[in-house]
Structure formats: C-alpha cells, structure tokens
C-alpha cells in the first residue's frame, strides 16, 4: 500500500524550527502539534509520513523528484521522492541528486573529475509523461563541465533549477533546457491545468516568483477557458 | 503574518458528512502543496491527505482513501477536505498544512510548514 511504501521516508519531510532556517524568517505561524523545545520553537513531531503531493519536479525540493511512489502506479499520486544517488537507477535528470545526472538509465558523478573538457549528452524530454519510460524525442545537445560548478547565467544550459543562479530557473527551451528568469508581477505564467501538460510546452516559462502566484488576470476572467491569459499577482 | 484557518468541524453520527475548509490569510499558498493531517486522543498525528498546487496529483491514507476527497481553490486561497461515510475512529482534531514550495525557494525538501490551529470533528456511533 502507498503506507507501507511510505513509511520508509518517515522523517524525510522534517522541518527545521519553524520561522528558522526554512526560508521564512521570522515568519509568524502555526506550528505543529509537536514538542516543544528551549527557546519556544516548536518542531513537528516525527510520528509518521508527510507526503508532499506533485506534478512536477519543480515543486519538490532539491534533493528530490517528483513521481508515483509505486511502479506501474497510480497515475494521479505522485509525490516528492528523496534524489537517486550516485550509480543508481534512473530515468531522467531531476531523478539524480545535485552532482550527478542520469546517463544511460544510472545516475553519475557531474564532478569535473568525470569530465574531459565537454561532455556530449542525451537529453531525453518524454512528451506528455515525464516519468514514463525513457521514449520520447531525443536531442544531442553539448553541455560545458562548467556548469556544474559555476551557477548558469541566463541562457545557460542547466538540468535542474539549482544549476542556475538566483533568480533563474532550468526551463525547457525546444529540445534543451536553458536557464531562464524567474517570473514577476504581471508577467504571462503558466497554469497546467492536467497533469502531465508541461511535458508539451518547448518553449517552457519558469513559475512566479516569491509572494507571487500564478492566476487569472482579472479582465480575462469572462474569457473562454482556452483563451484565459495566467499572470504572475501578488498574494 | 501567515495564518491558516480551519472550520466546517463538528459533532456528526456515523455514516454522515462534514466538510472541512482551510482558508490561507497573509502570504498565501497556491502555488504550494497544502494537506490535512489529524491528531486524535493518545494516538501520534497521523496524514490524512494532501493536493499539489495545481490540484493534479492527490495523496490519500489508505484508511481514509474513497470516503475523504481534498480538492482546493486556488482563486479563494482554500484547501477543502471532503469527509464522506465517517466513522467513530475518524474522531479527531483535524490540522490543515501548507506547504514550502520545494526548490521554488531553495530548500532541499518540500515540507510542510505552516500549520492551522485545528477544528475537531466528532463522529458518534
């Protein structure tokens, strides 16, 4: 069962004091049903699982991907699943940890040890299901080692959000991801209304950035659903 | 300040209805993955379900999977938690969460991080 399967992640999702480290400093909340400890920061119990629901990579952390917790699994349940580390299997890059991407279905060290000037690279983007297998179209595409150590700059070829600088984002661009600007207020964003529907897009927008969110601007809203234009508002 | 509310709890006879609401105030979530999680007398919190921002991935616990249904509006900042055929062991305070946003801000994990104050739901038998 999705539990039992589960369990084994129990304290993945284990915050730090709240209003700590989890970048929201200072913010006032609600904490956890939880202990409390000296100097009044309440920390959630580690009682059992938190899954943390997705559609896609980009709303898991760093250290994970997003994908059905089974095989074969239900298609509508994907939540975030801590990061493949190095020589173990995978199916795309975000599967692998910061360090590493997925080469010939195993993740590998993008250390620049590994590297002998550039590497050439297949860059499988699976159209409609990210996380099917590896069919889909394929593209070469050129990757400099040095993007593994210096965050990419606007333009740069990344695998993941974490390969670019502040404030950009690894997005798709045709058969390749670059890093792109993080979107602000009252820029076009994007709203995957089903699941799956940002593996269509090649030229892919990155989401709102913070205290942003992507909705319907307000003149459009008696427009056709097809033809409602999503801009980045604040909260 | 960030603050989630919960209502729609109360006391209900086994096999009947509730409908749980979790409105976000302040800096709100819908970009966020929000869930609900209950903590019931000398028992740990247990998850209940939760919703990805854009609705399309839902979770369920396997003991509450086919009754419960979580859906959200995002227009109104509101997670809302279905709770259909209940039963005396689905007696509980019932927290909404909200979640982080994952790498969208750089942390390693996408948790939970904002908590509501909880409404009590009650099924008699």
């Known amino acids: 069962t999705l539990n039992s399967v589960l369990n084994s992640n129990a304290i993945k999702n284990l915050p730090p004091p709240l209003g700590g480290a989890a970048g929201h400093p200072g913010s006032a909340v609600s904490a956890a049903p939880g202990i409390l400890y000296p100097g009044g920061n309440k920390y959630q119990t580690i009682d059992n699982y938190q899954p943390y629901p997705c559609a896609e990579d980009e709303e898991c952390g760093t250290d994970e991907y997003c994908a059905s917790p089974t095989r074969g699994g239900d298609a509508g349940v994907q939540i975030c699943l801590a990061c493949r580390k190095r020589r173990k299997r995978c199916m795309r890059h975000a599967m692998c940890c910061p360090g590493n991407y997925c080469k010939n279905g195993i993740c590998v060290s993008s250390d620049q040890n590994h590297f002998r000037g550039e590497i050439e690279e297949t860059i499988t983007e699976s159209f409609g299901n990210d996380h099917s297998t590896l069919d889909g179209y394929s593209r070469r595409t050129t990757l400099s080692s040095k993007m593994y150590h210096t965050k990419g700059q606007e333009g740069s070829v990344c695998l993941r959000s974490s390969d670019c600088a502040s404030g950009l984002c690894c997005a798709r661009h045709f058969w390749s991801k670059i890093c792109k600007p993080v979107l602000k207020e009252g820029q076009v964003c994007t709203k995957h209304r089903r699941k799956g529907s940002h593996g269509l897009e090649i030229f892919q927008r990155c989401y709102c950035g913070e205290g942003l969110s992507c909705r319907i601007q307000k003149d459009h809203h008696q427009a056709s659903n097809s033809s409602r234009l999503h801009t980045c508002q604040r909260h | 300040e960030v603050q989630l509310v919960e209502s729609g709890g109360g006391l209900v006879q086994a096999g009947g209805s509730l409908r749980l609401s979790c409105a976000a105030s302040?800096?709100?979530?819908?970009?966020?993955?929000m869930g609900w999680f209950r903590l019931a007398p000398g028992k740990e919190r247990e998850f209940v379900a939760a919703i990805s921002w854009s609705g399309g991935s839902t979770v369920y616990a396997d003991s509450v999977k086919g009754r419960f249904t979580i859906s959200r509006d995002n227009a109104k900042n509101t997670v809302y938690l279905q709770m259909n055929s209940l039963k005396p062991e689905d007696t509980a305070v019932y927290y909404c969460?909200?979640?982080?946003?994952?790498?969208?801000?750089?942390?390693?994990?996408?948790?939970?991080?904002?908590w509501g104050q909880g409404t009590q739901v009650t099924v008699s038998s």
């Open positions: 302040g800096r709100t979530f819908s970009s966020y993955a």
């Open positions: 969460a909200a979640g982080n946003g994952g790498r969208t801000y750089g942390h390693s994990r996408a948790r939970y991080d904002y």
